[in-house]
């Protein structure tokens, strides 16, 4: 993940009794919340692996990098980081692995400088559509977020509240067009089977998109055309069987793109011919010499770059094992 790493500066720990005594008041300039480590020089607060059940109220106003990883927060309510005075400097917030299952509307409001947010490794059964936009207006104030890390946020099957997980995440990404400035989006390891049509067109500033280790079976309706700034597209470890002409042309038309396609179950029949031709010519696919056929059986483990049209005939019926990843 691309969240900030800690500075080597010295950290001060606070005694647990100090914070509770003043939590209702504005924090003192040098105060550090209970169970946290603070470095004013590094503008960093770490409250890591402390089983916290809520966000400390007495965070120092200087905090620029806040680590709240490995806790038991469960719910992030509206205004979870709203303070008087506001945490105006907070730029990087890491909440990964904190057992969050609900992030409510406006959870990140009143953080005017927040550029990096990492919610990875939380079983987010309930991510409000307005978690990042803060309001249900059709056009919200632009979010300052530049990097949003949402790897492995899929909850267990029995906690998914009988609705589309893909849809829930997409709603939060698109609400109010607040994330138009987003440059890095990581959505790896979320069991995504599909992306709703045109979703990426609404995130035009993307430079880096990570969709690896999902279950995407097709990119036919995923348009990359508007993503002219896209530099890296990670599609490794999905269930892609072939990329069709429209997708190939769109990828080739992106000026800075690097695409990663390893470990997909490519079907090497006659429909693969265009992709093989493209792979032989393109420079955009990283490690293209590692791409191999998964099906039909006679083609298993053949390198795509080594195939010619005579190798690619139709029409196989896939065995059940290849139907769903």
């Amino acid at each position: 993940s691309s969240s900030p790493t800690s500075s080597a500066s010295s950290f001060s720990s606070s005694a647990p009794f100090l914070a509770s005594a003043v939590s209702a008041q504005p924090p003192l300039p040098d105060q550090c919340p209970a169970l946290c480590e603070c470095s004013e020089a590094a503008r960093t607060v770490k409250c890591v692996n402390r089983n916290l059940t809520e966000v400390p109220t007495d965070l120092p106003a200087y905090v620029r990098n806040l680590f709240l990883t490995g806790n038991q927060l469960a719910v992030l309510p509206a205004g979870a980081f709203a303070r008087r005075p506001p945490l105006a400097e907070l730029a990087a917030l890491n909440l990964s692995g904190s057992r969050l299952d609900e992030v409510r509307a406006g959870a990140f409001e009143h953080l005017p400088s927040l550029r990096q947010l990492d919610l990875s490794h939380n079983p987010l059964a309930d991510l409000s559509p307005f978690a990042f936009s803060g309001s249900n207006a059709s056009v919200s104030a632009p979010s300052p977020l530049v990097e949003l890390i949402l790897n492995h946020i899929v909850p267990p099957e029995d906690e998914r509240q009988n609705r589309s997980f893909e849809g829930m995440v997409v709603a939060a990404l698109l609400a109010g067009r607040a994330l138009q400035g987003l440059r890095r989006l990581e959505l790896a390891s979320n069991h995504f089977l599909y992306l709703p049509r045109d979703v990426l067109a609404q995130l035009p500033s993307l430079r880096h998109l990570d969709l690896s280790n999902n279950s995407l079976v097709s990119l036919t309706y995923v348009s990359f055309r508007n993503l002219t700034h896209l530099e890296s597209l990670h599609l490794e470890d999905n269930a892609l069987k072939v990329l069709h002409n429209g997708t190939l042309a769109e990828l080739q038309g992106l000026p800075h793109i690097r695409v990663f396609l390893d470990n997909n179950p490519w079907v090497c029949d006659c429909h693969m011919a265009d992709m093989v031709t493209w792979l032989k010519e393109t420079e955009v696919v990283q490690g293209k010499d590692r791409l191999t056929c998964a099906y039909p059986e006679k083609m298993r483990n053949r390198v795509l770059l080594e195939l010619n049209s005579a190798d690619l005939d139709c029409d196989p019926i896939l065995p059940p094992s290849l139907q769903t990843s």
Epitope: G167, P196, R197, V217, S218, K241, V242, Q323
Partner: antibody, heavy 118, light 107 residues
């Protein structure tokens, strides 16, 4: 929960026009394409076209290109289909359906019956 | 337009039977096939998308398979509430087209 509420049944004269509405609730209207589908009595389903509520872009089945016009009103989360120059061939139940996985329709309205009769 | 030929048109079944419906596309539609159930007087309901993926809340007795042009929809153990018309649909190429439907009726 997701709901698509369609307008009521219509009985119209040949040559007339009709405009069917489909009010969406329970999801972000602009995030998903809206499809329209025709079902004649005792028959299969025919895809009429779809519309992207985000920008109003449409995609029609050529068969219905001169018959149907799809529009949306984002302010009211409502999709519309206008059918013109109606004949008895156009008597059917018309459904609006929200797209989930691309092309597949995961929520359907209750249907609007259109009867063309003189 | 891609034609989806669905067979059979009718199926007489008993509770507990295994039922298989097939759909053949006039040209390859890759893995872009959905299956719907329509009960009398109701709107269609999405059961399967991308050939084999059950939609949310759909019981696991409903399965789909296939690739390219030939697709199969199976109900492993038919129950009384499964009596309905089932449709396949290709979503590979516009216009999206449906099969003619298969009506499941009890013996």
């Amino acid at each position: 929960q997701v709901q698509l509420q369609q307008s009521g049944p219509e009985v119209v004269n040949p040559g007339a026009s009709v405009k069917i509405s489909c009010k969406a609730s329970g999801y972000t209207f602009t995030d998903y394409y809206m499809n329209w589908v025709k079902q004649s009595r005792g028959k299969s389903l025919e895809w009429i076209g779809d519309i992207n509520p985000n920008n109003g872009g449409t995609n029609y089945n050529q068969k219905f290109k001169d018959k149907a016009t799809l529009t949306v009103d984002k302010s009211s989360n409502t999709a519309y289909m206008e059918l013109r120059s109606l004949t008895s061939e156009n008597s059917a139940v018309y459904y609006c359906a929200k797209e989930g996985p691309p092309g597949a329709m995961d929520y359907w309205g209750q249907g609007t019956s259109v009867t063309v009769s003189s | 337009n891609i034609v989806m030929t669905q067979t059979p048109k009718f199926l007489l079944v008993s509770a507990g039977d295994r039922v298989t419906i097939t759909c053949k596309a006039s040209q390859s539609v890759s893995n872009h096939v959905a299956w719907y159930q329509q009960k009398p007087g109701q709107s269609p309901k999405l059961l399967i998308y991308y050939v084999s993926n059950r939609y949310i809340g759909v019981p696991d007795r409903f399965t789909g398979s296939g690739y390219g042009t030939d697709f199969t929809f199976t109900i492993s153990t038919v129950q009384a509430e499964d009596l309905a018309v089932y449709f396949c649909q290709q979503v590979y190429s516009s216009p999206f087209t449906f099969g003619g439907g298969t009506r499941l009726e009890m013996k």
